[in-house]
Interface confidence: low
């Protein structure tokens, strides 16, 4: 369960991969596409609104939280659209939705070494947002293997 329906804090940040590729969003045929690309120097990075929530239930791995609670986030690159996990298709999609947001829009936030973060699906513990073939996908991570796997690491910059 998520403590309260209001976020405890919000921030606007651009999202990039561990290898400094930008996550960008483009409206095509009335739906949003998500791209992972090298940005030209003069192009502005897309911003995402991150809303932070406290969760009483830890995920399958103890990540960094606040006072022992897990931090959950939702990510919204534009008004009324949120990133959502599609566990059937192993994909990450942008959907228009109203509040209260579905569970698929919530991700457990894990801090990694040197300020990288990863996003674990609330609906599918052990599955993370990752980069696959230049797009975002859901990637299953074996905790006994490499949690620091580059393809699930992201950097947030203001």
């Amino acid at each position: 369960s998520i403590t309260g329906i209001s976020p405890i804090t919000e921030s606007l940040a651009s999202l990039s991969t561990y290898n400094d590729q930008s996550i960008t969003f483009a409206l095509e045929d009335e739906s949003y596409e998500i791209y992972v690309e090298d940005l030209k120097k003069d192009k502005k990075k897309d911003k995402v609104l991150l809303s932070y929530y406290e969760s009483q239930h830890p995920s399958s791995e103890s990540g960094d939280g606040v006072d022992g609670k897990m931090l959950m986030v939702t990510l919204s690159p534009t008004k009324d659209f949120w990133l959502q996990a599609n566990n059937k298709e192993h994909s990450v999609e942008l959907h228009k939705c109203e509040k209260p947001l579905p569970d698929q829009a919530f991700f457990v936030l894990h801090n990694r070494s040197f300020n990288c973060v990863s996003f674990e699906c609330k609906t599918d513990p052990g599955v993370f947002i990752g980069v696959k073939d230049n797009h975002l996908a859901l990637i299953k991570v074996d905790y006994s293997e490499n949690l620091g796997s580059e393809n699930i690491l992201f950097k947030l910059s203001e």
Epitope: D20, D64, R112, S113, F114, N115, G148, E150, S157, E158
Partner: antibody, heavy 119, light 110 residues
Framework: EVQLLESGGGLVQPGGSLRLSCAAS????????MHWVRQAPGKGLEWVSS????????YYADSVKGRFTISRDNSKNTLYLQMNSLRAEDTAVYYC????????????WGQGTLVTVSS | QSVLTQPPSASGTPGQRVTISCSGS????????VNWYQQLPGTAPKLLIY???MRRLGVPDRFSGSKSGTSASLAISGLRSEDEADYYC???????????FGGGTKLTVL
């Protein structure tokens, strides 16, 4: 004012132990990765250890692995470094440093505390 | 022996431009941001440049950073006497799971 203040340094014999503390103020300590960095007299900076905001992720330099233990008490806004089996080569000024969430770099440093290992 | 390699010393006259290099490998500089720190005599280090080329707030624009491949550099233009200090580069190393520093460069303003 954002501040880090180290304490606990001093003279210790080889094989001895010491616990360093770093008191944080002026910021939400529990939100930040914290690190220890040391500097031997007249030498360069050497990273020692880091700990994530809720102690889930801990890293050590090979030179101190198995001898030093980093920990933190978020309720006391304090970072610790327990140093055991000290050697002469551990003699250094020990700095605690905050890893800035915006900078991905050590944006705040303490003034340092000197640890001397000598018989 | 430091993982990142810097020249031990550099010098210049007031008003000049000096560059300090920092070379590493694919597991550190090649894959991660480089940070630069300034340490004035008898004081704790201070962050100058983060994310390879971003100046920290309050740092004069005479200081600039760049990165190419597995090397990085710090350039100081319009050198001033107060720039006399030790300069260190640092980066995260993926294989060591550690922060690695350069050995430091002592900058002398002649």
């Amino acid at each position: 004012e954002v501040q880090l203040l180290e304490s606990g340094g001093g003279l210790v014999q080889p094989g001895g132990s010491l616990r360093l503390s770093c008191a944080a103020s002026g910021f939400t300590f529990s939100n930040y990765y914290m690190h220890w960095v040391r500097q031997a007299p007249g030498k360069g900076l050497e990273w020692v250890s880091s700990i994530s905001s809720s102690s889930s992720y801990i890293y050590y330099a090979d030179s101190v692995k198995g001898r030093f233990t980093i920990s933190r008490d978020n309720s006391k806004n304090t970072l610790y470094l327990q140093m055991n089996s000290l050697r002469a080569e551990d003699t250094a000024v020990y700095y605690c440093a905050r890893l800035g969430t915006r900078h991905d770099a050590f944006d705040i440093w303490g003034q340092g505390t000197l640890v001397t290992v000598s018989s | 022996q430091s993982v990142l390699t810097q020249p031990p010393s550099a010098s210049g006259t007031p008003g000049q431009r000096v560059t300090i290099s920092c070379s590493g490998s694919s597991s550190n500089i090649g894959n991660n941001a480089v940070n630069w720190y300034q340490q004035l005599p008898g004081t704790a280090p201070k962050l100058l440049i983060y994310a390879s080329n971003m100046r920290r707030l309050g740092v004069p624009d005479r200081f600039s950073g760049s990165k190419s491949g597995t090397s990085a550099s710090l350039a100081i233009s319009g050198l001033r006497s107060e720039d006399e200090a030790d300069y260190y580069c640092a980066a995260w190393d993926d294989s060591q799971k550690a922060v690695v520093f350069g050995g430091g460069t002592k900058l002398t303003v002649l």
